[in-house]
């Protein structure tokens, strides 16, 4: 058993049928010695008396808010949550496996640049009685500061019969140098509590590996005289790290017909312009990627050919 | 501690091409190592990230773009002094700091070259003959060093008398390649910045 926060405790249980559970001793936070009784949640049934209460915690019916009283007055509370260990592996019931970029990916994180700011998000099908708390650091043995905001509900979607809820959090490394070569990964830890179930999820990454630039901006077409060709031009996104000659991007330009089955023409360039043939009803799209370290491509910025 | 913006004339920077080749070569070598050593801990998540140049060179700091010198988090590092003559410096206006930067890059390359050659000698003794260093990568390191053309003491190749532990050698190879790839990215960024300046 360990303390999650004041008066909230997590009991770690080896979770299998007929498991013996864990013996827990609760102590009433009071100078009083006599006439103390204990109850669980809203029930008025007295579970025991005395300054301490010993309970055998086996299942969720044994968890909840234990309260000690004296003469009708509440003295203190202890909330017990359960953390299930199933065959040596901590349970992951609360969050959905996003399966990207690999199986058992519960937290996904992205950064728009090298400033040390990043966003993480996760999915769940649970809509109520759910709280999240996020902590982060650079490294784990001698952790350096990363400040995270509060997790917020950022999207709701319908997936088949189920509703899916997306939560996200923004974090910022306290003293980040965009040019630094990372040797210690960022660690992100999310505590999730659903009713009386506690779970924790972690992710470890280097900012360089989660970079995903914003799409190029100001995408424009300039027809070339007496030709079906157009000059496409664009600019670096505002959110990208500067100077651009140091933090350079590379670009992919794509000409896509109306039908998804039509052949796509693709050009790769380090410049911020390219000459392509514009077909009728086609659209031109451009996306960006760090020129020197191949992390994710940005989303496409698009303009119609017409 | 930073690079001035107004230095060599555009197109007068022969090191850019070499640094691009270097990044390509080390990336290919790392990919090959990850595939060949699939039963060894060779991914970025599994290895310890060690920098063999730590406390010996200060490339990131010496080559910091002018625009980032206002960022205090970028300025908390060591001072290192280097020899200052090099053929990549195509202009007499080149500042002392730029020479320091390129000299630091040269020292990095020299250190990695020695490590890789020592390691290759060990890998050649492996009866499994599982992996060797790409000669192209070693050649590209050499070319960039020649383009930088700094006078520097030659570092003798480390020789070891004890029987090599091939498992440890292969893991060390992965660690070195990951670190060298990160340094090659920095070198490429620096060369690109200098070329644009």
């Amino acid at each position: 058993i360990w303390e999650l926060k004041k008066d909230v405790y997590v009991v770690e249980l080896d979770w299998y049928p007929d498991a013996p559970g864990e013996m827990v001793v609760l102590t009433c936070d009071t100078p009083e010695e006599d006439g103390i009784t204990w109850t669980l949640d809203q029930s008025s049934e007295v579970l025991g008396s005395g300054k301490t209460l010993t309970i055998q915690v086996k299942e969720f019916g044994d968890a909840g808010q234990y309260t000690c009283h004296k003469g009708g007055e509440v003295l203190s509370h202890s909330l017990l949550l359960l953390h299930k260990k199933e065959d040596g592996i901590w349970s992951t019931d609360i969050l959905k496996d996003q399966k990207e970029p690999k199986n058992k990916t519960f937290l996904r994180c992205e950064a728009k640049n090298y400033s040390g700011r990043f966003t993480c998000w996760w999915l769940t099908t649970i809509s109520t009685d759910l709280t999240f708390s996020v902590k982060s650091s650079r490294g784990s043995s001698d952790p350096q500061g990363v400040t995270c905001g509060a997790a917020t509900l950022s999207a709701e979607r319908v997936r088949g019969d189920n509703k899916e809820y997306e939560y996200s959090v923004e974090c910022q490394e306290d003293s980040a140098c965009p040019a630094a070569e990372e040797s210690l990964p960022i660690e992100v830890m999310v505590d999730a509590v659903h009713k009386l179930k506690y779970e924790n999820y972690t992710s470890s990454f280097f900012i360089r590996d989660i970079i995903k630039p914003d799409p190029p901006k100001n995408l424009q077409l300039k027809p070339l005289k007496n030709s079906r060709q157009v000059e496409v031009s664009w600019e670096y996104p505002d959110t990208w790290s500067t100077p651009h000659s140091y933090f350079s991007l590379t670009f992919c330009v794509q000409v896509q017909g109306k039908s998804k089955r039509e052949k796509k023409d693709r050009v790769f360039t380090d410049k911020t312009s390219a000459t392509v043939i514009c077909r009728k009803n086609a659209s031109i799209s451009v996306r960006a990627q760090d020129r020197y370290y191949s992390s994710s491509w940005s989303e496409w910025a698009s303009v119609p050919c017409s | 501690r930073n690079l001035p913006v107004a230095t060599p004339d555009p197109g007068m920077f022969p090191c850019l091409h070499h640094s691009q080749n270097l990044l390509r070569a080390v990336s290919n070598m790392l990919q090959k190592a990850r595939q060949t050593l699939e039963f060894y801990p060779c991914t970025s998540e599994e290895i310890d990230h060690e920098d063999i140049t730590k406390d010996k060179t200060s490339t990131v700091e010496a080559c910091l773009p002018l625009e980032l010198t206002k960022n205090e988090s970028c300025l908390n590092s060591r001072e290192t002094s280097f020899i200052t003559n090099g053929s990549c410096l195509a202009s007499r206006k080149t500042s002392f700091m730029m020479a320091l930067c390129l000299s630091s890059i040269y020292e990095d390359l020299k250190m990695y070259q020695v490590e890789f050659k020592t390691m290759n000698a060990k890998l050649l003794m492996d009866p499994k003959r599982q992996i060797f260093l790409d000669q192209n990568m070693l050649a590209v390191i050499d070319e960039l060093m020649q383009a930088l053309n700094f006078n520097s003491e030659t570092v003798p190749q480390k020789s070891s008398l004890e029987e090599p532990d091939f498992y440890k050698t292969k893991i060390k190879l992965c660690i070195l390649l990951h670190a060298f790839r990160i340094r090659a990215v920095t070198i490429d960024r620096v060369m690109s910045y200098l070329n644009a300046s």
Epitope: P17, D18, E59, D87, G88, I89, D93, N103 | -
Partner: antibody
Framework: QVQLVQSGGGVVQPGRSLRLSCAAS????????MHWVRQAPGKGLEWVAF????????YYADSVKGRFTISRDNSKNTLYLQMKSLRAEDTAVYYC????????WGQGTMVTVSS | SYVLTQPPSVSGTPGQRVTISCSGG????????VKWYQQLPGTAPKLLIY???QRPSGVPDRFSGSKSGTSASLAITGVQAEDEADYYC????????????FGTGTKVTVLG
Amino acid sequence: QVQLVQSGGGVVQPGRSLRLSCAASGFTFSSYGMHWVRQAPGKGLEWVAFIRYDGSNKYYADSVKGRFTISRDNSKNTLYLQMKSLRAEDTAVYYCKTHGSHDNWGQGTMVTVSS
Amino acid sequence: SYVLTQPPSVSGTPGQRVTISCSGGRSNIGSNDVKWYQQLPGTAPKLLIYGNDQRPSGVPDRFSGSKSGTSASLAITGVQAEDEADYYCQSYDRGTHPALLFGTGTKVTVLG
């Protein structure tokens, strides 16, 4: 005490269907994940499928994906394995088992796929 | 497709020490706990070892388990005639959990 009693096995022709049941008692069935494991005659153990305690997530071995469906009825304390498009290579003893560090197994039920 | 490899058979005379190896990789045994089962002919598997080296109550202390890196082993010190059975190791793969990964199985024969 924990008990898992299996039923539903038998002889079936290739291409046909069969449903296995596993009735649980002696524990809070709705709190635990459950597996199906099979063993072909003279061969080793092969995992078939898993279902979460609340039925929200199901996982299958590649060899049965798209043909077998694991389900549970927590009100009846029963686990099921619906097997469709059966093949000769599905011939095996099928076991249900609880998920956890200490597990409990059903007695096994024989499924023979033969024309 | 078995990812955990065991020797097909091992044998020993009563009282001898018999060991069975179970070889895996970084993503399974290297990252997860190992269990060992004993299966007597015509019966369901019986749990012998969980959590690499833990014995459930009722399992004789001549059975012991251990794990090192990407391999695990089961030792029977002072093997007895009633130990003649098939033995299976089991773990998980970190990418496919909760799918159970079983070893290929080892037939233990008690001679004499």
